[in-house]
Amino acid sequence: EPCVEVVPNITYQCMELNFYKIPDNLPFSTKNLDLSFNPLRHLGSYSFFSFPELQVLDLSRCEIQTIEDGAYQSLSHLSTLILTGNPIQSLALGAFSGLSSLQKLVAVETNLASLENFPIGHLKTLKELNVAHNLIQSFKLPEYFSNLTNLEHLDLSSNKIQSIYCTDLRVLHQMPLLNLSLDLSLNPMNFIQPGAFKEIRLHKLTLRNNFDSLNVMKTCIQGLAGLEVHRLVLGEFRNEGNLEKFDKSALEGLCNLTIEEFRLAYLDYYLDDIIDLFNCLTNVSSFSLVSVTIERVKDFSYNFGWQHLELVNCKFGQFPTLKLKSLKRLTFTSNKGGNAFSEVDLPSLEFLDLSRNGLSFKGCCSQSDFGTTSLKYLDLSFNGVITMSSNFLGLEQLEHLDFQHSNLKQMSEFSVFLSLRNLIYLDISHTHTRVAFNGIFNGLSSLEVLKMAGNSFQENFLPDIFTELRNLTFLDLSQCQLEQLSPTAFNSLSSLQVLNMSHNNFFSLDTFPYKCLNSLQVLDYSLNHIMTSKKQELQHFPSSLAFLNLTQNDFACTCEHQSFLQWIKDQRQLLVEVERMECATPSDKQGMPVLSLNITCQMNK
Amino acid sequence: QKQYWVCNSSDASISYTYCDKMQYPISINVNPCIELKRSKGLLHIFYIPRRDLKQLYFNLYITVNTMNLPKRKEVICRGSDDDYSFCRALKGETVNTTISFSFKGIKFSKGKYKCVVEAISGSPEEMLFCLEFVILHQPNSN
């Protein structure tokens, strides 16, 4: 069975084809090759000599037991080598020779028992080494690591490392890898020698499900003293053994680390005293809790020095009390409990993501809701009912505003966005908005992107609501049940490049409303009910137009519409997916491609 | 279509079939077997995925006695610092995991429950596997 040609001459997918040897019928130009799940078993010297351009090679689960010297010799362009799930028993010293451009080596679940005799010391270009799910017992980083000066990611998770000693990291003292991210999760750790991490600098350290008791956790974290780490991730996994007890003493040792960003990821334990628990983390710049349950929500009003707070997938009794002077970014997403938003006091806040919480807002939105006048980014998407009761007074700095899939109330009662002259991006898609007021978008003089799909208009008619949006480049009006539009609806949109009118209820096409759209490149009218043209004579669309989508409409392929069908043929160079432009009537022509019709009408007269 | 039996409990019988062409082997055990009136137990899965499990989600299509419920999407792996350790599993890596579950206080009517589980993962998204579970529910007289 042949390999699947994914990208001709470049990418080949040969997965699970029962190959016992490497295929030699693929082009020399192959750059990406997936040979996974084939019983190759043995890689001899120069096994891939016929793939001189290869960049990515996937050998996952190929039952490989032996890799000989120079197996990959000649692959000087190879950047990624994946060996996951091979029961390697014999790895020659020169197994990886010739891989002068290798950046990523994945040797997960390969029976690797030690880093010491893993022959990769010459791979100077290596950026990522993943040796997770192996049998490694010692965390001693061999001397050859001093050659791996580009290493950025080392994944040692799910191994058998129990202890870390001062000597294990000696090589890092000799050549500080300023950018190294280290994952030690799921190693059964019980001892870290104090001083082992002294004056070590890491970009990221991840320790999840490493400790089987609170005491072990406490002493191991104390053993991290002296570490300078940009991002520290602690926590557990839901499907692994969890700590029976967790209290403030667990994290006391963090006072002896220098941490820029901290994250606690999943804890099967109720956190009741955040102030004491995170006492050593008051001055990290970014603080993040993922999948934890928080009892006392008032604690977030303590004077933490965080600039970025992230609360994701957590459980709260009620919406937390947030009073944080220095906070610039707040991400509060996919949380449960506390369904009603309550005011926060965050005077420095510039970025606020409150999406996917099922929150309801009694009144939105003004400076008093968020306690800031600096807000530039606000995401309230995928929430509950949001009642618009103020038009963003004090929030004039906003540049990005997203309400999609929330239920907006009182949108047509006043000019909701009047203050937002700096707004560039607005998404009110699927917000149950019924446009009944022409001044709905007044004030949005800088707006470039407007997404309002899945809403509705009074009498299914699009009025002149865009008159002030002179900078608009993208407009989505799909799924709005529109049947008609004002001939001057788009007259002021001279910068508009993309207009999506798909999935509406238009029965005829008219070029007149688009005459002023001098920058229009894409016009999508798919999934309407277009049968014919509105006027007998259709003019041309703007000369800038490059893509016109008229697919899945109800074209009437009869003589009375001959001029319209001819006009469509004349637009052939603009049309996309022409094979999906089919006749709907008459019944004898149903399903026929519109462009293949020979429109001579004498026969039917 | 071969049917794979999972387990029987006092009020339910659970089995599954594959609803995809690939039919890559997957081993599923539930201990103790699910009782629909209330249940607490462990789900054990042994599986070798054909793609990375990063950004894994399930599309669930549930049918109750021939009545179709709306499609439901359950995100399991968001993509970074996920709740489950198997979210970091790579294509070809053995996934051998036990997940605890519990639910109570749901009253189910007697009959045949079908649940098609489409597992989607990776970037670009592709189907990982598709299983159709059948639960025959015989409520006790109480």
Epitope: K21, I22, D24, F49, S50, S74 | -
Partner: nanobody, 112 residues
């Protein structure tokens, strides 16, 4: 036991030609992808010519139009015709059987 014996190397002036031969014993080459690989001191090794069983060939840009690989399955031999040689073509040239290995190599030195 499979053996590959290269010959034909030597010292030449820039612009001259050489023809390398590789005689294989212990295995039939008719079903094997064959090629030549060169290693210059202090430089990254590179494939200079590959020939498949159907006769299709590959050359990197650095030798394209100057080098030509051919095979004689009856004689179990592979050849590399090198024309318009340049100083940067200097190195040890190894005959390769994909998946099996290489010979001892033959030295090619091109002087200016």
């Amino acid at each position: 036991e499979v053996q590959l014996v290269e010959s034909g190397g030597g010292l030449v002036q820039a612009g001259e030609s050489l023809r390398l031969s590789c005689v294989v014993s212990g295995i039939s080459i008719s079903t094997k992808v064959m090629g030549w690989y060169r290693q210059a001191p202090g430089k990254q090794g590179e494939s200079v010519a590959i020939i498949k069983t159907d006769g299709s060939t590959y050359y990197p840009d650095s030798v394209k139009g100057r080098f030509a690989i051919s095979r004689d399955n009856a004689k179990n031999t592979v050849y590399l015709q090198m024309n318009s040689l340049k100083v940067e073509d200097t190195g040890v040239y190894y005959c390769i059987i994909t998946g099996w290995g290489r010979g001892q190599g033959t030295q090619v030195t091109v002087s200016s």
